[in-house]
C-alpha cells in the first residue's frame, strides 16, 4: 500500500515509511571541509 513520503508537521499524513522526519531539525555541527 502507498505511504506518504513526506508531509510537514501541520499535515495529518504519515511519514513513517518515508525515511524522512516530518520536520527535520537543523544539524548543529558542520562537516569539515
Amino acid at each position: 500500500s502507498e505511504t506518504t513520503t513526506g508531509t510537514s508537521s501541520n499535515s495529518s499524513q504519515s511519514t513513517s515509511n518515508s525515511g524522512l522526519a516530518p520536520n527535520p531539525t537543523n544539524a548543529t555541527t558542520k562537516a569539515a571541509g
Epitope: T5, T7, S18, G19, A21, P24, T25, A27
Partner: antibody, heavy 115, light 112 residues
Framework: EVKLEESGGGLVQPGGSMKLSCVVS????????MNWVRQSPEKGLEWVAQ??????????RFAESVKGRFTISRDDSKSDVYLQMNNLRTEDTGIYYC??????WGQGTTLTVSS | DVVMTQTPLTLSVTIGQPASISCKSS???????????LNWLLQRPGQSPKRLIY???NLDSGVPDRFTGSGSGTDFTLKISRVEAEDLGVYYC?????????FGGGTKLEIK
C-alpha cells in the same frame, strides 16, 4: 508500479543553465514531498533540493552548495517536478536522481558541466 | 551537517557467508517523535539506489529477510545472514532526522 523518470541532462558550459524534469506515476504525486539527489565520484550521494506539498505552500529546501543557484518546482496536475539550475559549476557534474525521499528513485539523468 | 561514517569501505564475502556493515552518525538520529530516521540503500552496478530498510530495522516490501537492520542513537548496523550473488553492489546509509539529509560514503560488497 511506482515510476520516476528524469530527463533534461546533458553537457553545459560553466556559468550556463539547465532544467531537469521528472515525471512520476503509480502514486498520488500531490501527497509526496519530492527531492533531487545527485551522485558524483568525488562527493558520492548528495541531497540537493526538496519541495513539499501544496498544504505546506510548496516550501522548498536546498543544500548550501546550490542555494541561490538552483530552484525546485512542481506541477501537481502533471505529476512533474523540476530542477532549474543556473550559474552551473564544474562541481555540479553528476547523475541527478529524482526521489520521493528515500523510498522511490528514478533512473537518473547525467549533467556534465565542462568547457 | 551530520556526518555519516560507514565501515568497511569494501567487503569481500563468500556466497552463503554473513556480512556486516557499520554506519555511525556524528549526532543522534533519534527524532522528537521517538522514531529514528536511518535508512539503508543498495545500489547495484549500473542501477539507481534502491531502499532496503527504513526506520533502522523495517524491511521494504520484497526485501529478503536475510537482511537485518539494527542500532540506535548514533550507531547502526546492516547485517546479511547469508550473502547471495544478487547482493553485490554498494550499500549506503542515509539519515532523514536532521537537515540537510546526509549519506554515508558507501560500502562496496564484493563476492569472493
Amino acid at each position: 508500479e511506482v515510476k520516476l523518470e528524469e530527463s533534461g541532462g546533458g553537457l553545459v558550459q560553466p556559468g550556463g543553465s539547465m532544467k531537469l524534469s521528472c515525471v512520476v506515476s503509480g502514486l498520488t504525486f500531490s501527497n509526496h514531498w519530492m527531492n533531487w539527489v545527485r551522485q558524483s565520484p568525488e562527493k558520492g550521494l548528495e541531497w540537493v533540493a526538496q519541495i513539499q506539498l501544496k498544504s505546506d505552500n510548496y516550501a522548498t529546501r536546498f543544500a548550501e552548495s546550490v542555494k541561490g543557484r538552483f530552484t525546485i518546482s512542481r506541477d501537481d496536475s502533471k505529476s512533474d517536478v523540476y530542477l532549474q539550475m543556473n550559474n552551473l559549476r564544474t562541481e555540479d557534474t553528476g547523475i541527478y536522481y529524482c526521489t520521493t525521499g528515500t523510498d522511490y528513485w528514478g533512473q537518473g539523468t547525467t549533467l556534465t558541466v565542462s568547457s | 551537517d551530520v556526518v555519516m561514517t560507514q565501515t568497511p569501505l569494501t567487503l569481500s564475502v563468500t556466497i552463503g557467508q554473513p556480512a556486516s556493515i557499520s554506519c555511525k552518525s556524528s549526532q543522534s538520529l533519534l527524532y522528537s517523535n521517538g522514531k529514528t530516521y536511518l535508512n539503508w540503500l543498495l545500489q547495484r552496478p549500473g542501477q539507481s539506489p534502491k531502499r532496503l530498510i527504513y526506520l533502522v530495522s523495517n524491511l521494504d516490501s520484497g526485501v529478503p529477510d536475510r537482511f537485518t537492520g539494527s542500532g540506535s542513537g548514533t550507531d547502526f548496523t546492516l547485517k546479511i545472514s547469508r550473502v547471495e550473488a544478487e547482493d553485490l553492489g554498494v550499500y549506503y546509509c542515509i539519515q532523514g532526522t536532521h537537515f540537510p539529509y546526509t549519506f554515508g560514503g558507501g560500502t562496496k560488497l564484493e563476492i569472493k
